[in-house]
Every structure is written in structure tokens, then in C-alpha cells.
Amino acid sequence: LQDLCSNCPAGTFCDNNRSQICSPCPPNSFSSAGGQRTCDICRQCKGVFKTRKECSSTSNAECDCISGYHCLGAECSMCEQDCKQGQELTKKGCKDCCFGTFNDQKRGICRPWTNCSLDGKSVLVNGTKERDVVCGPSPADLSPGASSATPPAPAREPGHSPQ
């Protein structure tokens, strides 16, 4: 009996009610592998999800997030609201980054500007809500024979952002 079921191709299921005949998957269902005893219900892309690929008898539907949202999780299982650069998402909506913090993405959270002085450098370009500061060379970097070693990771002071 098991052998009969294993002959059922993708897009069908092994119908126990009909002497294990291979029956086509009903509408809005699919089987992506052979030998299945049931077909899986197609994923529905609704609400903040939009359809990227329609369901077929052999493959599930694939979803994306609607405009203004971005995907999280495997196969875009979650959608999270976008914000503008210079903002972060809170429960009360998109909030501007606090002074001294920035976010250069449409998702994620604000983080503090680099503290140039912790690396013995000076601020070359001021930071904004959307961009980190640019640190200028320290006096030692400008002296003759100065090392051209790779600078360390940016030093930061702990900051906080609104919620």
C-alpha cells in the first residue's frame, strides 16, 4: 500500500477514501513533494502582505510586504513598518532620532554618533539624524612618518533612543 502512495506525484495526494488513488490537490492547496497523504493549504498574502508568486498545485504562494513595510523572518513571515532615515519605529509610530543619535536606514533603531575625541580625533563633518559624524585626522596622523595602520572600530558613548 505504501508503494501505491509513493507513486503519487507532486500536485496530488494519496486518497485513502478512494483506494489510494492519486487525486489532484483541491483548489487553494498544494503538495510540493510526491507521496503526500494530504495537500497543504496555500498561504494567503493579505493585509500587510502582497502576493509575489501565486500558489500552484505544486508550490506554495510567496508573499512580500506592501509598500512602506519590510520583510522579517523566513519566507517573509513578518512585515514591519518602515520609517524614514533619521527615525526609528516605536509603538507610537516613527519618531525622530534624539539629538546625538542617527539612523541611516529605513528600518532599525537610532545609535549614537561616533565620539571622535575618544580616538584622539576631531569632528570633520557634524552628524545629523541620518548620518554619523565624520572624524578628522588627529594631529599625530598629520605628523611626518605617522603610521598608516587601520584605525580601530569607532568609539561610542552609550546613548538611548525614544520609545
Epitope: 522579517l72 523572518g73 509603538k91 538611548h160 533612543s161 520609545q163
Partner: antibody, heavy 116, light 108 residues
Framework: QVQLVQSGAEVKKPGESLKISCKGS????????ISWVRQMPGKGLEWMGK????????NYSPSFQGQVTISADKSISTAYLQWSSLKASDTAMYYC?????????WGQGTLVTVSS | DIELTQPPSVSVAPGQTARISCSGD??????AHWYQQKPGQAPVVVIY???NRPSGIPERFSGSNSGNTATLTISGTQAEDEADYYC???????????FGGGTKLTVL
């Protein structure tokens, strides 16, 4: 597809140092936060801290500040968790996870055993 | 930083409704997320942003969050729902994430 693959299990003695890793693939590693989460044997999940690999900005839970160091090398899409001097109480499963609030992808975990 | 308190265990008969609470000062001001963890596995999101269910998570899972309590509700609980459940939140002040202590759900 997105994956976080962690380094293998470690057995260490108290006082030894250790650095475990979490390699991301299938997404823009530099622009997503990576968090580290501890789970002691038979206990719950504890958020340790996070790093933004793009510029290596880190932020620690007060409970773990000064106890561990989180770092990243964006050129090889890898985040690290390290100890300079392990204690028996550091014995736990350590997970890396993508995100800062919603942790949508998790590594398989690295079991760290510290015993004399 | 905010502390999240969960009951250590909850028991429910198959087909009945399980409710797992997560209490913390003004947790309703932040998003609450819920994770399911089965033995030997990494956690999985079952509810995000208070009440949203990821695709692939059964409709019997739902969530709410207001005041000092977030709640995960599992309607028509099934044996496969037996697991540990953790609430979590992210607080922008201090930029910290925190997990609740976890609740072991037993399906009798």
C-alpha cells in the same frame, strides 16, 4: 536563504579565555543588528547585548556589561562573543539572533561548558 | 530596566484555551513579542508587536498587550503546543531588550 551559523561546542577550564562566533549569510550582514542570548542549563533566555556590524557599535545589558565583549568583522559577516576569564557560572547555551527587538533568525546555539 | 514576570508553568487540557501572562511596568507602552522554544531547539517567534502572527503560525495563537500585562492566548490547544514560551520587549530608553522568565506549557 538567511542563515546564522555558530561555532561548535567548547569545553574550557575556569580562568581560560574564549571567543565564539556567529556567521551570517543570505542578507546584508552589515545593516542588521546581531544580539547574543544566554540560556543556562534548565533556565530561561537572557538578552546579553547587541552589535551593529556596519560600524561595530555595541550595547550591553547591565547584567553582562564588563563580563563579556561583543565584536564583529563585517568583512567576513561574523559576530563574536568573548570572555577573558571564564567562570563555572558561564556554562550555558549561547545563541546569536538577528535583530534588536524582534529576533527573526537564530543560530543553532553554541554550548559552552566551564569545568575544572 | 524593565522586568518581565511570567508564571513558571501553565497546564491545559487538549482543546482548551491556554493563557500565559507577562507583567511589567507599563509594558503596554512597548511592543511585546512572544517566542516558543521546544527542547533542543532555538526559539521561534509566535507573536510579534503585541498581536501579529507570523505566517506559518497557526491561527489559534493570538496576543494582546495593555497596561502592565501582555498575554499570549492559545485557543484549542494541541499536544504539539507543549513548549516553553517567553515574552520579550525592547525599550528604547537604554536601548535594551529583555525576556520574561519563561512559562512551561503542559498539555495534559
Amino acid at each position: 536563504q538567511v542563515q546564522l551559523v555558530q561555532s561548535g561546542a567548547e569545553v574550557k577550564k575556569p580562568g581560560e579565555s574564549l571567543k565564539i562566533s556567529c556567521k551570517g549569510s543570505g542578507y546584508s550582514f552589515s545593516t542588521y543588528w546581531i544580539s547574543w542570548v544566554r540560556q543556562m542549563p534548565g533556565k530561561g533566555l537572557e538578552w546579553m547585548g547587541k552589535i551593529y556590524p556596519g560600524d561595530s557599535y555595541t550595547n550591553y545589558s547591565p547584567s553582562f556589561q564588563g563580563q563579556v565583549t561583543i565584536s564583529a568583522d563585517k568583512s567576513i559577516s561574523t559576530a563574536y562573543l568573548q570572555w577573558s576569564s571564564l567562570k563555572a557560572s558561564d556554562t550555558a547555551m549561547y545563541y546569536c539572533a538577528r535583530g534588536y527587538g524582534i529576533f527573526d533568525y537564530w543560530g543553532q546555539g553554541t554550548l559552552v561548558t566551564v569545568s575544572s | 530596566d524593565i522586568e518581565l514576570t511570567q508564571p513558571p508553568s501553565v497546564s491545559v487540557a487538549p482543546g482548551q484555551t491556554a493563557r500565559i501572562s507577562c507583567s511589567g511596568d507599563n509594558i503596554g507602552d512597548q511592543y511585546a513579542h512572544w517566542y516558543q522554544q521546544k527542547p533542543g531547539q532555538a526559539p521561534v517567534v509566535v507573536i510579534y508587536q503585541d498581536k501579529n502572527r507570523p505566517s506559518g503560525i497557526p491561527e489559534r495563537f493570538s496576543g494582546s498587550n495593555s497596561g502592565n500585562t501582555a498575554t499570549l492566548t492559545i485557543s484549542g490547544t494541541q499536544a504539539e503546543d507543549e513548549a516553553d514560551y517567553y515574552c520579550a520587549t525592547y525599550t528604547g530608553f537604554g536601548s535594551l531588550a529583555v525576556f520574561g522568565g519563561g512559562t512551561k506549557l503542559t498539555v495534559l
